[in-house]
């Protein structure tokens, strides 16, 4: 029995920040769980982790090079990624594991979300404007 995960197919980070919502076919209320966000087609790099249980507040971990926060809904975890770099454009997969109460559950692999980080292109005013036309 696997948890299903829904993610937006694509998100664009115009201001180097993005909210990625992972929606689950499972209610996380009063559960001990570990939600994580993985970068790359092979999910090789785990970049953010949200750990929650019934007795203490949510704990959020960010891998070095990532600035991450997490928010819990009844059937969702939203990862808020800030200070993203253009080279962090990639596909990101949500993962969830529920440890307690039994049985242990995890998710079917989702389709992932492509996060496209747009660089900030400032248009400077020209230093030497050409001759103005009458």
């Amino acid at each position: 029995n696997k948890i299903l995960v829904k993610q937006s197919p694509m998100l664009v980070a115009y201001d180097n920040a993005v909210n990625l919502s992972c929606k689950y076919s499972y209610n996380l209320f009063s559960r001990e769980f570990r939600a994580s966000l993985h970068k790359g087609l092979d999910s090789a790099v785990e970049v953010c982790v949200v750990y929650g249980n019934y007795s203490q507040q949510l704990q959020v971990y960010s891998k070095t090079g990532f600035n991450c926060d997490g928010k819990l809904g009844n059937e969702s975890v939203t990862f808020y990624l800030q200070n993203l770099y253009v080279n962090q454009t990639d596909i990101y997969f949500c993962k969830i594991e529920v440890m307690y109460p039994p049985p242990y559950l995890d998710n079917e692999k989702s389709n992932g979300t492509i996060i496209h980080v747009k660089g900030k292109h400032l248009c400077p005013s020209p230093l030497f404007p050409g001759p103005s036309k009458p």
Epitope: R34, S36, E46, Y51, Y61, K63, M99, Y100, D106
Partner: nanobody, 124 residues
Framework: EVQLVESGGGEVQTGGSLRLSCAAS????????MGWFRQAPGKEREFVAA????????DYAESVKGRFTISRDNAKNTVYLEMNSLRAEDTAVYYC?????????????????WGQGTLVTVKP
């Protein structure tokens, strides 16, 4: 709830070796990291080494690189710290830590659970 039990500390001469072990028990997820920190008298607890579950990510403090090796046996939920070429400044209480982060974190605040500590004394 995770419990950590360290062993292997003791007294050794300068240049000697020790192997510390830390066994974890309790509810474990498929990915987590474990690390070693140490605290000398009157000093802050400092990072020594850490390793993730897949054993493809390990990190060391500069002061122990090339002398200490961290490893783990996932079947036994145990992490080891092999300490060679020990120096007087390695004398400290060594603590094992557990984090739900899936990478070898050197940040003390990332660690949720700690062992009781094991004393390592290096005699000149």
């Amino acid at each position: 709830e995770v419990q950590l039990v360290e062993s292997g500390g003791g007294e050794v001469q300068t240049g000697g070796s020790l192997r510390l072990s830390c066994a974890a028990s309790g509810r474990m997820f498929s990915n987590y990291a474990m690390g070693w920190f140490r605290q000398a008298p009157g000093k802050e607890r400092e990072f020594v080494a850490a390793i993730n579950y897949r054993r493809d990510d390990a990190d060391y403090a500069e002061s122990v690189k090339g002398r200490f090796t961290i490893s783990r046996d996932n079947a036994k939920n145990t992490v080891y710290l092999e300490m060679n070429s020990l120096r007087a400044e390695d004398t400290a209480v060594y603590y094992c830590g557990f984090t739900y982060a899936g990478w070898a974190s050197s940040r003390r605040d990332d660690y949720n659970y700690w062992g009781q500590g094991t004393l390592v004394t290096v005699k000149p």
